[in-house]
């Protein structure tokens, strides 16, 4: 992580501790999947961790920005577009859909800080709701009725 | 959310805004299916939250600490120990286990903190990391082998 | 082999519940989707539900707010409730067994022989 | 639901006739379609399952095939004791639903 200068809050926005209050932002994931030992392809393993064991297998993919807190933030990809079937582990079942789990999670953007009178003065930080996703699910398609 | 002091740090305690660097907390998951709609049982709806039509149904828990940031978390607990099957939605299918997907995550727990003197001098933020669970997942059974 | 014989009122009157029951002879009556089928004079078949293993139970939407299927595997038997009958609810009601292929109900055999239920007043 | 149609709903035919009835589902259910004969006053009796499998003891001159939305139940050679109604089933989603059934008469 790259250092940041010292963050002077200026009136009208919040502290830092004021915003660690409200900082609800998941960590990278315990260990994404070894690419050599579990490629990243649509089927499901019987090793390795649990995104290539899912029947709705994903991926992460790094999401870093050096100006947001945290800086580096993983998204889930799903591999296929059904659930891969419990049987095979490797055809897709169309009776199931690989679903995205969203998460609206804060997260805070570095912002040259004004004084009264204009002046720069450090950095603050703007807190944002920002969607990650954090896995796929294997769903049953929604019926229209 | 209560209001807590502000925080002080002494000599040798990370600064709000370095703990802040580190802050990756989830928050609440959207929406807990609303009970009466949904209710808590092992079977995959065909509307409704992801986590009710998920072949791999789970529920929300509430954890609340008011000495904790964020005070509220949510942990996933599976309603069934397999995957529903897709044909029906009502019966679990035994080739495929449902399990939770973990995630060490990094809480800040309120502590007071004291002066060069031992002084209480209001309160500082220690970071901790903290296993919560965010989902369940449809999975094939580990080989051993 | 296995063998499944409906029994039941004849008769039912609008409004009430039919009550139905199959036994089943010849065969145990575990991991089996234990289902009824129905057929109103001289028209189509229709699936109404079934239950599985003595637990989970799946209903025919179009029926599913009035009906009931349990299954008594002390006394080898399954049975079906359908309250607040009409005349639309006379037919031939079936039991049958879902076979369980690959943890899926798959097909129907065998069937009882069938017992004719008319709502009338 | 998935609807299945049958054609013809009814057909005439001798005995020794090459029989063909079709089975048509709303959306693709692979090979998860069955065949059922009826007699009258009689329960259905499973003929074919998973699409073209013949059940134990079912004459082999009753086979069926297709996968996907479309079937075929087909008869070789037609005897006195196949004049009965036939339906199809799907069992790839529940709610299970039946064709509407072919009846097949002495011509």
């Known amino acids: 992580y790259s250092h940041w200068p010292s963050c002077c809050p200026s009136k009208g926005q919040d502290t830092s501790e004021e915003l660690l209050r409200w900082s609800t932002v998941p960590v990278p994931p315990l260990e994404p999947a070894r690419p050599n030992r579990h490629p990243e392809s649509c089927r499901a393993s019987e090793d390795g961790p649990l995104n290539s064991r899912a029947i709705s297998p994903w991926r992460y993919e790094l999401d870093r920005d050096l100006n947001r807190l945290p800086q580096d933030l993983y998204h889930a990809r799903c591999l296929c577009p059904h659930c891969v079937s419990l049987q095979t582990g490797s055809h897709m079942d169309p009776r199931g859909n690989s679903e995205l789990l969203y998460h609206n999670q804060t997260v805070f953007y570095r912002r040259p800080c004004h004084g009264e009178k204009g002046t720069h003065k450090g950095y603050c930080l703007e807190r944002r709701l920002y969607r990650v996703s954090l896995a796929c699910v294997c769903v049953r398609p929604r019926v229209m009725g | 959310y209560s209001h807590w002091p502000s925080c002080c740090p002494s000599k040798g305690q990370d600064t709000s805004e370095e703990l802040l660097r580190w802050s990756t907390v989830p928050v609440p998951p959207l929406e807990p299916a609303r009970p009466n709609r949904h209710p808590e049982s092992c079977r995959a709806s065909e509307d409704g939250p992801l986590n009710s039509r998920a072949i791999s149904p789970w529920r929300y828990e509430l954890d609340r600490d008011l000495n904790r940031l964020p005070q509220d978390l949510y942990h996933a607990r599976c309603l069934c120990p397999h995957c529903v099957s897709l044909q029906t939605g009502s019966h679990m299918d035994p080739r495929g286990n449902s399990e939770l997907l973990y995630h060490n995550q990094t809480v800040f727990y309120r502590r007071p903190c004291h002066g060069e003197k031992g002084t209480h001098k209001g309160y500082c933020l220690e970071r901790r990391l903290y296993r919560v669970s965010l989902a369940c997942v449809c999975v094939r059974p580990r080989v051993m082998g | 082999q296995v063998q499944l014989q409906e029994s039941g009122p004849g008769l039912v009157k609008p409004s009430e519940t039919l009550s139905l029951t199959c036994t089943v002879s010849g065969g145990s009556i575990s991991n089996y989707f234990w289902s009824w089928i129905r057929q109103p004079p001289g028209k189509g078949l229709e699936w109404i539900g079934f239950n599985y293993n003595s637990g989970s139970t799946n209903y025919n939407p179009s029926l599913k707010s009035r009906v009931t299927i349990s299954v008594d595997t002390s006394k080898n038997q399954f049975s079906l409730k359908l309250s607040s009958v009409t005349a639309a609810d006379t037919a031939v009601y079936y039991c049958a067994r879902g076979y369980n292929w690959n943890y899926e109900i798959a097909w129907f055999d065998p069937w009882g022989q069938g017992t004719l239920v008319t709502v009338s007043s | 639901d998935i609807q299945m149609t049958q054609s013809p709903s009814s057909l005439s035919a001798s005995v020794g006739d090459r029989v063909t009835i079709t089975c048509r589902a709303s959306?693709?259910?692979?090979?998860?379609l069955n065949w059922y004969q009826q007699k009258p006053g009689k329960a259905p009796k499973l003929l074919i399952y998973?699409?073209?499998s013949l059940q134990s003891g079912v004459p082999s001159r009753f086979s069926g095939s297709g996968s996907g939305t479309d079937f075929t139940l087909t008869i070789s050679s037609l005897q006195p004791e196949d004049f009965a109604t036939y339906y199809c089933q799907q069992s790839y989603l529940t709610p299970l639903t039946f064709g509407g059934g072919t009846k097949v008469e002495i011509k």
């Open positions: 998973a699409a073209s």
């Open positions: 959306q693709s259910i692979s090979s998860y």
